[in-house]
Interface confidence: low
């Protein structure tokens, strides 16, 4: 629909992206040696938005390896049984329960690195991830509420006279749409998809002819995007009067000239009747003049000057309008 409609409008789009939250690791590689475990928070929960298709690395609390007994990753994803990945240091043994997603793995062998990686992040990875480190001093936790972000596809088109539609398709979470300048907007429509993404649609109308370019600004956690479109000028009362003024004036002038010549012809005929000694050439000239005048004013070959003037007037009018912001 959008593509078909966009062909009918002067489509000029640019986008400026403003990206937020740029990389994908929450781990500090240097393992902080904590002599006094009381300094380490026993329970840390982090809300973490991660963009889809990136790689994410989740890490455990910074506990020294020699103090470890067991490392457990607990993964709770929506609509799935809880998955646990366990490593026992004493037996150097790893065990998995209910873990079916091959994209969620240890970064390397747990004895080398206890971090968990998601490679790549998919929309189904929304959920809670928790690392539990068992030590002689007790258990230490680090939990992540992973929120998978999906960048919406943004489209902008003119659907009908001076009405623009901006869509942010399949974003997660829902994007927000605003317009510059503000128009007469219908309530924003939201369409929810089964995978958790949302399509947001905003339709606005601009009545005044002084607005030619409108910008749709889409705000989203993955970054902001702006598209603009030049609305087609519509034949409206004010504009039409301006555009057709040269033709109206031209018509009045022609009618005036034709009327004037017609009057001359009538008075000429009277002269002829009154004075029959008048030369024929004058009569012929008088009779021919209205026709010649008519032909010159209506034949395209003769009409170039006026056409060019009208065209220039029209271009200057449209040009001014298109560059009025």
């Amino acid at each position: 629909e959008g593509a078909a409609q966009s062909n009918n409008s002067l489509m000029l789009q640019t986008s400026k992206e403003n990206h937020t939250l740029a990389s994908n690791s929450l781990c500090m590689d240097e393992k902080q040696i904590t002599q006094n475990h009381s300094k380490v928070l026993a329970e840390v929960n982090i809300s973490w938005p991660v963009q889809m298709a990136r790689n994410a690395v989740l890490c455990c609390p910074p506990i020294e390896f020699r103090n470890l007994i067991v490392i457990t990753w607990e993964i709770i994803l929506r609509g799935q049984p809880s998955c646990t990945k366990t490593y026992r240091k004493d037996t150097n043994e790893t065990k998995e329960t209910n873990c079916t997603d091959e994209r969620i793995t240890w970064v390397s062998t747990p004895d080398q690195n206890s971090d968990l990686q998601i490679h790549p992040v998919a929309i189904t990875h929304d959920g809670y991830y928790r690392c539990i480190m068992a030590t002689p001093d007790g258990n230490f936790h680090r939990g992540y509420h992973l929120q998978v972000l999906v960048t919406p596809e943004v489209t902008l088109f003119e659907s009908r006279n001076r009405t623009a539609v901006c869509k942010a398709v399949a974003g997660k979470p829902a994007a927000q749409i605003s317009w510059i300048p503000a128009g007469d907007c219908a309530p924003t429509e939201q369409e929810y998809w089964g995978n958790g993404t949302v399509t947001v649609k905003s339709t606005c109308h601009w009545e005044g002819h002084n607005v030619s370019t409108v910008t749709c600004h889409v705000s989203h956690l993955t970054g902001n995007k702006s598209l603009y479109i030049e609305l087609l000028p519509v034949p409206g009362a004010k504009k039409s009067a301006k555009l057709y003024m040269p033709y109206v004036i031209l018509t009045i002038i022609i009618l005036t000239i034709v009327g004037f010549i017609w009057l001359l012809k009538i008075s000429g005929c009277r002269k002829y009747n009154l004075n029959k000694t008048e030369s024929t050439s004058v009569v012929e000239e008088d009779e021919m003049q209205p026709y010649a005048s008519y032909t010159e004013k209506n034949n395209p070959l003769y009409d170039t000057t006026n056409k060019v003037k009208a065209s220039q007037a029209l271009q200057s009018e449209v040009g001014t309008d298109l560059h009025t912001l």
């Epitope: 403003n18 990206h19 937020t20 939250l21 740029a22 990389s23 994908n24 690791s25 929450l26 781990c27 500090m28 590689d29 240097e30 809300s47 973490w48 938005p49 991660v50 990136r54 790689n55 690395v57 970064v107 690195n113 990686q117 929120q147 956690l221 970054g223 902001n224």
Partner: antibody, heavy 119, light 112 residues
Framework: QVQLVESGGGVVQPGRSLRLSCVAS????????MHWVRQAPGKGLEWVAI????????YYADSVKGRFTISRDNSKNTLYLQMNSLRAEDTAVYYC????????????WGQGTLVTVSS | DIVMTQSPLSLPVTPGEPASISCRSS???????????LDWYLQKPGQSPQLLIY???NRASGVPDRFSGSGSGTDFTLKISRLEAEDVGVYYC?????????FGQGTKVEIK
């Protein structure tokens, strides 16, 4: 321990090019976003560019956009900054820095390499 | 771009006394996840900058507990409870909410 070592700085004429390198060690380089930050003599810090951990995305400061290119080779644990059409205002110490968390701090910085653009 | 404004630009402090630096952003740095994307750095004379505080109030690894960060939205403060000689240098705040990352002008802390 984590180390970042920059190289490639020097004196260069305006309009010429230079390539800076930053070799990383002591951590899993491919897991981290990396930045270039610069500091003109006697001035404050100015962010220059970032590259995603997998190289898929790059962003630049407006002042260098179109002239500088950030890249990385994860197999060599190396970050690069290709600087073209250099200007006098690009004179600065260039630091590479590791992105600690998503948008939350540069936790390790290199020692910096000085780039002087002068005729 | 988000503009970061620090005050004061120069701060002479007596050792053992507290110090406070203010940082203001031109737009809110509070993300919908509840974190403020503001960091504090210290650049000691002749050295590279080092991370002190991330996400508004979290001390980076190895940073002494005399440093603390507070604030939310657009107004942030870095406090040093008792200034030590090794704390002198230029302190910068930086926003990490959106590109381009932007720094404050810096606050030079020196011994009075």
């Amino acid at each position: 321990q984590v180390q970042l070592v920059e190289s490639g700085g020097g004196v260069v004429q305006p309009g010429r090019s230079l390539r800076l390198s930053c070799v990383a060690s002591g951590f899993t380089f491919s897991s981290y976003g990396m930045h270039w930050v610069r500091q003109a003599p006697g001035k404050g810090l100015e962010w220059v560019a970032i590259i995603w951990n997998d190289g898929s995305n790059r962003y630049y400061a407006d002042s260098v956009k179109g002239r500088f290119t950030i890249s990385r080779d994860n197999s060599k644990n190396t970050l690069y900054l290709q600087m073209n059409s250099l200007r006098a205002e690009d004179t600065a110490v260039y630091y590479c820095a590791r992105d600690r968390i998503v948008g939350a701090g540069f936790d390790y910085w290199g020692q910096g390499t000085l780039v002087t653009v002068s005729s | 771009d988000i503009v970061m404004t620090q005050s004061p630009l120069s701060l002479p402090v007596t050792p053992g006394e507290p110090a406070s630096i203010s940082c203001r952003s031109s737009q809110s740095l509070l993300h919908s996840n509840g974190y403020n994307y503001l960091d504090w750095y210290l650049q000691k004379p002749g050295q590279s900058p080092q991370l002190l505080i991330y996400l508004g109030s979290n001390r980076a690894s190895g940073v002494p507990d005399r440093f603390s960060g507070s604030g939310s939205g657009t107004d942030f403060t870095l406090k040093i409870s008792r200034l030590e000689a090794e704390d002198v240098g230029v302190y910068y705040c930086m926003q990490g909410l959106q590109t381009p990352w932007t720094f404050g002008q810096g606050t030079k802390v020196e011994i009075k």
